[in-house]
Amino acid sequence: KEVVLLDFAAMKGELGWLTHPYGKGWDLMQNIMDDMPIYMYSVCNVVSGDQDNWLRTNWVYREEAERIFIELKFTVRDCNSFPGGASSCKETFNLYYAESDVDYGTNFQKRQFTKIDTIAPDEITVSSDFEARNVKLNVEERMVGPLTRKGFYLAFQDIGACVALLSVRVYYKKCPEMLQSLARFPETIAVAVSDTQPLATVAGTCVDHAVVPYGGEGPLMHCTVDGEWLVPIGQCLCQEGYEKVEDACRACSPGFFKSEASESPCLECPEHTLPSTEGATSCQCEEGYFRAPEDPLSMSCTRPPSAPNYLTAIGMGAKVELRWTAPKDTGGRQDIVYSVTCEQCWPESGECGPCEASVRYSEPPHALTRTSVTVSDLEPHMNYTFAVEARNGVSGLVTSRSFRTASVSINQTEPPKVRLEDRSTTSLSVTWSIPVSQQSRVWKYEVTYRKKGDANSYNVRRTEGFSVTLDDLAPDTTYLVQVQALTQEGQGAGSKVHEFQTLSTEGSANMAV
């Protein structure tokens, strides 16, 4: 931004500048250019010997300027365009200035003035241009500063040229008031801080409802000596509840919200929220809907799921496979998990209690993501009730629970009681027994054995009797042996795993029971 202190051309001849000597030399004249009247100060004493004609401006108030720019538009005639070359003719003039705190009026003293420069034209007006009225306009600019007094004068010294001053413009530069990145920067006088620091650092202030982001830098810009803003640093962001609209922050409209200072716009209130008021930072959940602590405010409010669908319990001897389907209502969430709990009841006494400690699950029964689980190590002659609860991220925010139950009675055999009957270096004779009342239900017995420490291979023998001899074994080797009854319903309870050792080739070893 240029702040003009003096503009001769704009004054249309109304500036009465001082000429010295009075009535000679410089003269105010009017001409027609492009069908418009134009005023100029002119002098053309090219055949009268040495000249010393001065033209002084009126006193110019400095305002805030520290350095001023002087722009001159002028024309100079070619000395060769005059008859005989006009021997005393010159083609330059001198520019001077003087600072003062007061206007001296018509009191003009050359010694008060300091020379700024000799002004020479880039183009002179030759005869043909003059005749054709082609004004060869020269533009020269000079900078003066630092200025310290209240005001100043400019002066033009003619030393025998044929020159016309068409424009004298004096201005200083400011970086204009500016809005950048939601920060307001004040109008700033363009001045070099020092020779090594040609930029003035200016702090901006965030516009209404804008803030410096947490941990970020406040807005800064640099004002150059040319009055231009450079190198923005930092920024302001619209605070929560407000969004950027052009260079301002506007409150979120009703039904919209913004939860943090950011560059993003206000978002529409998500599903299952109550309509927000203007400038909302969040949208409240409808009754019965909730937000988990980790849920973003942009996410719909959700609710706990309904119970799992179609829970079935399929008994397989001493095992039960539980299967269910996902809840009909997920509550609007994807993070559904299931928990299985177990209760066992003794038919004789009707007593019931938790059975988590005595049964084995195919995977941990809490936070299940799949919709099936196998429960094994069930006790015979026991009634079991399994509850499958569906939970999601907001289930913890309510006291009610969503579960479905299924019951199953275990009629399988008791586990066989196993013992080692005999052994040799290459064989083991094993016997077992079960209660007589259950023997009719047993179809066969399955004996599983393997070397201790060898998890990769095992052997299975089936028999209808109550004993088996395991042959072709390695001497002096411990084997793991388990016996399980097979019934029409499937596998019965398995015995515990026993460790039996074959004899060494030396022949003496203790029997392991």
Epitope: D27, M29, Q30, N31, I32, P37, M40, S42, V43, C44, N45, V46, V47, T75, V76, R77, S81, F82, P83, T125, S127, S128, F130, E131, A132, R133, V135, C162, V163, A164
Partner: antibody, heavy 128, light 107 residues
Framework: EVQLLESGGGLVQPGGSLRLSCAAS????????MAWVRQAPGKGLEWVSR????????HYADSVKGRFTISRDNSKNTLYLQMNSLRAEDTAVYYC?????????????????????WGQGTLVTVSS | DIQMTQSPSTLSASVGDRVTITCRAS??????LAWYQQKPGKAPKLLIY???NLHTGVPSRFSGSGSGTEFSLTISGLQPDDFATYYC?????????FGQGTKVEIK
């Protein structure tokens, strides 16, 4: 010494034509703007037409526009005025005048010109 | 066209007198004004251009002044050779109009 010598004047009937000449000497003719100025008997001066140093541009007074044509031949140092459709009110002494920008000690030329050098004039009489 | 009006039309004066002729323009012509002297049966002669600039060879008793619409020609110390008719001419526009003339005669 600058000299301008007009010729070609005389008596002519209304509607007739005449061609005036102006022979120049003592200066560089091709540097000068040239003009014709007339003066009716016992009256003041009236500018008629002008022509630039190299033959253009040309300007005419409203009273003669379309009837008179100004021209020059720089190789012959001669200025001409072709006058057609002459009227009684064209009766006057016709002066050839010149202007040299070199003698105009101003930084910017005026919108038009004045006349530094004049011939002695030639009389044109339009009468039946 | 710009009209130029001179006054007086005739001026009677004696040798040594200071005489002033005025010229008024119908609109502003800045300082684009010339003055001529014409003697009977002779061609006009340029005296002053740009309102106040003396043409080469013209005696310094002649001076011109004015700007805009009001101009004057002053002869300080009238000489016998100065009795003639004087014309002003504007050259602010292409019409280059003359005043009607002022005759300076012997009183």
């Amino acid at each position: 010494e600058v000299q301008l010598l007009e010729s070609g004047g005389g008596l002519v009937q209304p509607g007739g034509s005449l061609r005036l000449s102006c022979a120049a000497s003592g200066f560089t003719f091709s540097h000068y703007m040239m003009a014709w100025v007339r003066q009716a008997p016992g009256k003041g001066l009236e500018w008629v037409s002008r022509i630039g140093p190299s033959g253009g541009p040309t300007h005419y007074a409203d009273s003669v526009k379309g009837r008179f044509t100004i021209s020059r031949d720089n190789s012959k140092n001669t200025l001409y005025l072709q006058m057609n459709s002459l009227r009684a009110e064209d009766t006057a002494v016709y002066y050839c005048a010149g202007y040299d920008s070199g003698y105009d000690y101003v930084a910017v030329a005026g919108p038009a010109e004045y006349f530094q050098h004049w011939g002695q004039g030639t009389l044109v009489t339009v009468s039946s | 066209d710009i009209q130029m009006t001179q006054s007086p039309s005739t001026l009677s004066a004696s040798v040594g007198d200071r005489v002033t002729i005025t010229c008024r323009a119908s609109q502003s012509i800045s300082t684009w004004l010339a003055w001529y002297q014409q003697k009977p049966g002779k061609a006009p002669k340029l005296l002053i251009y740009k309102a106040s600039n003396l043409h080469t060879g013209v005696p310094s008793r002649f001076s011109g002044s004015g700007s805009g619409t009001e101009f004057s020609l002053t002869i300080s110390g009238l000489q016998p050779d100065d009795f003639a008719t004087y014309y002003c001419q504007q050259y602010n526009s292409y019409s280059r109009t003359f005043g009607q003339g002022t005759k300076v005669e012997i009183k």
